[in-house]
Amino acid sequence: KFSKQSWGLENEALIVRCPRQGKPSYTVDWYYSQTNKSIPTQERNRVFASGQLLKFLPAAVADSGIYTCIVRSPTFNRTGYANVTIYKKQSDCNVPDYLMYSTVSGSEKNSKIYCPTIDLYNWTAPLEWFKNCQALQGSRYRAHKSFLVIDNVMTEDAGDYTCKFIHNENGANYSVTATRSFTVKDEQGFSLFPVIGAPAQNEIKEVEIGKNANLTCSACFGKGTQFLAAVLWQLNGTKITDFGEPRIQQEEGQNQSFSNGLACLDMVLRIADVKEEDLLLQYDCLALNLHGLRRHTVRLSRKNPIDHHS
C-alpha cells in the first residue's frame, strides 16, 4: 500500500514523491534500500533528496531500484517505498506499455489530456505535445497549462499522447517526457429496439429453380458501437446450423456499418441450387438486442419464365 512504482528515461529528469505523506515541517530521510545508504540532500549531487521528493537530475539506468523514505515526526515514523525503474531511450517511435501512464477517455464535451506527474516539476511553458510521435499542429489542439485540449474530438483522435517539458533546477534545464493513451467515448451513443431495414415484412422473393439465391437480413440498433446485438436467419423456426441443409448457409456481413449515424448489421442467407421444396419453407430474419427481438418473414416464389411470343 505504501509502495509506489515510478519510471523514467535515462538522461531525463525524474522526481519521485514519497508514498507516505506528512506535514511540510516533518523531516524525510531517503535511503537506497539495497545498501541502506542514505541519499544526500546536497543539490550538487546528481541524485539527491529534497524533503518528500527524490530527484534524479538526470536519471541513469543504474539508478533503478527500491528507495525507502521515512517521514519523521516528534511522535511517529512512517515508512514508504519507491520502486524506481529507469529505461534506456527507445530508438524507434513506439512507446512500450511499461512507460505508459494511465489511459484517459474523452468525448466531444470533454477532451482534456493532463500531462502525467508534471506537478512534481519546476517547469515553465510551453508544454509540447506529440501524438504517436508526431508534433501536434493545427488549431484543434490547444496546450493549456498542464493539459492538452482537443476541439471537436473524433474517433481518430484516439492514440498515444506524449507531453514534453523542461524542468529547471538551480539554473540547469532537464528534459522530461511522459506518455499516456487517450480513448474517445461516444457520449451520444444509445441503443434502441431493433429496426429491420430489409427484408420487408411478409416479402415474397422471386427465385429461379436450379439457380442460386441470396436473401439479406439487415437491421439497425442505435448509435455508436452496439454490444450484444445480432441478426440471423431461421428456417421454419429453426437455426440454420440446426436445420441440416448444406445448400443453405448464412454468412455474416462486415462488422457494424453506420447508416445515418446508426449502427447496422447484416446477415446474408445463401441458397445454392434452389429446389422446389425451398419454396415451402418460411424464412425468418431476426434482429435482437437487449431491448427485444424483431422478426420479418420472407417466402420464396417461383419466378415465371419470360414468354417469348413472335
Epitope: A230, E252, L286, L293
Partner: nanobody, 120 residues
C-alpha cells in the same frame, strides 16, 4: 435453469496476461451473441468485448483494442476473453453476458463476475 459461470480471474502484474472463460450450463436457448463487461469500484459498468455466436463478428471497446481477444466455442457453449498487456486500469470485476432468444422472447443472462486485479 441456464447459468453463466465465469472463471480465470486473479491477480496479475502489469504487462501480464489472463484468460477468462464463461461457460453456459443448463438448457440453453438459441444464443445470438455473448459479451464481456466490467465494473471497477465506484465506476459504471462498461462494455469490453462481444462476439456474435457464429463467431464472424467481434466488437471491442477502444480501451482494450489490440490487447484483448474474444472468442467462442459453440460446441462447449463457452466464450473466452484473452487479456494481454494488462494495465492497472483494467482492474475490475468482469461479467459475462449472453443474449439468447426463444420464439419472440429475448433472454439476457449475466454471470456473477470474476475479479481481475492488475497490480505490482
Amino acid at each position: 435453469e441456464v447459468q453463466l459461470v465465469e472463471s480465470g480471474g486473479g491477480l496479475v502484474q502489469p504487462g501480464g496476461s489472463l484468460r477468462l472463460s464463461c461457460a453456459a450450463s443448463g438448457r440453453t436457448h438459441s444464443t445470438a451473441s455473448m459479451g464481456w463487461f466490467r465494473q471497477a469500484p465506484g465506476k459504471e459498468r462498461e462494455e469490453v468485448a462481444a462476439i456474435s455466436w457464429s463467431g464472424g463478428r467481434t466488437y471491442y471497446a477502444d480501451s482494450v483494442k489490440g490487447r484483448f481477444t474474444i472468442s467462442a466455442d459453440n460446441s462447449k457453449n463457452t466464450a473466452y476473453l484473452q487479456m494481454n498487456s494488462l494495465k492497472p486500469e483494467d482492474t475490475a470485476v468482469y461479467y459475462c453476458a449472453r443474449l439468447a432468444f426463444q420464439g419472440n422472447t429475448v433472454f439476457d443472462l449475466w454471470g456473477q463476475g470474476t475479479l481481475v486485479t492488475v497490480s505490482s
